[in-house]
Amino acid sequence: WELTILHTNDVHSRLEQTSEDSSKCVNASRCMGGVARLFTKVQQIRRAEPNVLLLDAGDQYQGTIWFTVYKGAEVAHFMNALRYDAMALGNHEFDNGVEGLIEPLLKEAKFPILSANIKAKGPLASQISGLYLPYKVLPVGDEVVGIVGYTSKETPFLSNPGTNLVFEDEITALQPEVDKLKTLNVNKIIALGHSGFETDKLIAQKVRGVDVVVGGHSNTFLYTGNPPSKEVPAGKYPFIVTSDDGRKVPVVQAYAFGKYLGYLKIEFDERGNVISSHGNPILLNSSIPEDPSIKADINKWRIKLDNYSTQELGKTIVYLDGSSQSCRFRECNMGNLICDAMINNNLRHADEMFWNHVSMCILNGGGIRSPIDERNNGTITWENLAAVLPFGGTFDLVQLKGSTLKKAFEHSVHRYGQSTGEFLQVGGIHVVYDLSRKPGDRVVKLDVLCTKCRVPSYDPLKMDEIYKVILPNFLANGGDGFQMIKDELLRHDSGDQDINVVSTYISKMKVIYPAVEGRIKFS
């Protein structure tokens, strides 16, 4: 019996087609992805093949103005239209709190939403009961397939799930659910979830009874053969893991942003054992037409977005200096504003020992593309912010050793004075440079804001200590020459859309007046 698994993950609000790098579509003839194009391909496969499942491995939420405005209603609407069979909860599904998940998505989705390792407690337990499930058994042709969901146990540090959801260890939580499915005579089981490729592989290895793992979170691109676009494969598709009980378990992921549709064919024997598996992600390029009815619906929903981008978010009573003459040479107040917003967006009161789990931000000055003039009545709009942060990136959470941070700050000024983009703006960091010293030895003081303290204060950076830092995904991926970050990071979790982070902060503060306050000094 053959099953076709179509899968997406980390779509992050890319409802419309995008450029090849998943930013805003500029030249339509070369654009990719989007739900209208995805629907065309899915329907083509559904018509051609008998046993098809369309699955999403989480993080539909967060990433473009679509999510800012529609807050998840767009996800439910268009996933319903595409007739997804199941979705696993990702960490970003909690970005607007539990209410922001329940009302727009859980109550509106016509497909099951899954996570076996999220347990509700207290007053939330009855409110959320039945709205998401640990597993779902689906009829597929003449057979049944069990799907068990899982979500990153780091979600409390990455999003806003509140205090009434407990995120358990994935493997510990999945095993009893899979065991139950087995006792209920379900012999074909897919683990669908959002914990990253390393955890996906562990699930394949450790959870007895799981036949296939469909993952997300790490934006992993797998491919067999010559890849069709710019993404470099992290391994073959499917990636085969040998389980502890000797089975070959295929593990798949489909990069991110709706650029690809994962396509996996699995052959099962009568007992539900995987006999063979093969496939590849399908690049959703312009050779695949956009479905006209879905496209028309997208255009209808788009109208509200255009209105939103000109509405006032808040006011500034000072000039927001985002000029390259400032932000690529010295501390600029636009950099301070953005870093303060990044830290504010990551406030999660972890426990009594820590005032927060992260206190530091770094931001490449070259990523700040425009100032905002306060003389326009002080008004700040989404449109203004889109000029400052036009690349559609995310502000991510990484863990780095102190020694890596020191290298990053040396890189920040290694060719100072040439108006290059790598000059770092900061938050929760005091840095002093001596430009008279040779490149690679210019950082003379580097103090960082403590997290394990009740009264935050600045202490010298310790080379061997592990620090959490908020930074643009561009830097986490080694952009602007920050190869040491990419090579040495100990953990990387993708965060929220950059503009959304800053707009939310401005809306919250109502009136802003960021200053230049001595975060970056030259001796």
């Epitope: 099951p112 779902k136 058994v137 009829p139 003449d142 005579n185 009568e270």
Partner: antibody, heavy 119, light 107 residues
Framework: QVQLVESGGGVAQPGRSLSLSCAAS????????MHWVRQAPGKGLEWVAL????????YYADSVKGRFSISRDNSKNTLYLQMNSLRAEDTAVYYC????????????WGQGTLVTVSS | EIVLTQSPATLSLSPGERATLSCRAS??????LAWYQQKPGQAPRLLIY???NRATGIPARFSGSGSGTDFTLTISSLEPEDFAVYYC?????????FGPGTKVDIK
């Protein structure tokens, strides 16, 4: 031990409605699909409808499609069959049946309730 | 829809004899075929599922075989309590059909 007890049978006129219930006990009701199967007097068995363990899918025999509706309340461990637009050929004993293996193993049957459609 | 034909309609045998009941499908039903026993005034009882698996508590004298379109229920040595009507049942695309039944009576 597993028990399935049907109720609600009786006499109804053609064109009228009747509702059957089945009270389940002795097993985790919400884990199992449930069927209604009927048997006209002196005749063979005829499958009527199936409902998924969580009520997310329903399937019907062509002979009852559009007239009968299967439902369940997992909090009450109860299966229902709403029968509308009844016809004389719907006269039968209606059995409530547990499905232990996704349509392959109808392993526990109730004793049945008789529905008579007559003017 | 798939039609099941059972033969013979009636099988007259003595206790201790072997009974072979046949069920033929109008098209392939893979292995999704079950056998039920029904005695007068009682509900049916599951005997065999997935063509050849004995249900819980069913004596070893009952066995099922076959695949595709041709299936057989065999009772190796009839006991007095085995005289009843036997139905086969299939599912295909979540639509279920029963055969018309074979009555096994005492010769």
């Amino acid at each position: 031990q597993v028990q399935l007890v049907e109720s609600g049978g009786g006499v109804a006129q053609p064109g009228r409605s009747l509702s059957l219930s089945c009270a389940a006990s002795g097993f985790t009701f919400s884990d199992y699909g449930m069927h209604w199967v009927r048997q006209a007097p002196g005749k063979g068995l005829e499958w009527v409808a199936l409902i998924w363990y969580d009520a997310s899918f329903e399937y019907y025999a062509d002979s009852v499609k559009g007239r009968f509706s299967i439902s369940r309340d997992n909090s009450k461990n109860t299966l229902y069959l709403q029968m509308n637009s009844l016809r004389a050929e719907d006269t039968a004993v209606y059995y409530c049946v547990r499905d232990a293996q996704w349509g392959s193993r109808l392993d526990y049957w109730g004793q049945g309730t008789l529905v008579t459609v007559s003017s | 829809e798939i039609v099941l034909t059972q033969s013979p309609a009636t099988l007259s045998l003595s206790p201790g004899e072997r009974a072979t009941l046949s069920c033929r499908a109008s098209q392939s039903v893979s292995r999704y075929l079950a056998w039920y026993q029904q005695k007068p005034g009682q509900a049916p009882r599951l005997l065999i599922y997935d063509a050849s698996n004995r249900a819980t508590g069913i004596p070893a004298r009952f066995s099922g075989s076959g695949s595709g379109t041709d299936f057989t229920l065999t009772i190796s040595s009839l006991e007095p309590e085995d005289f009843a009507v036997y139905y086969c049942q299939q599912r295909s695309n979540w639509i279920f059909t029963f055969g018309p039944g074979t009555k096994v009576d005492i010769k």
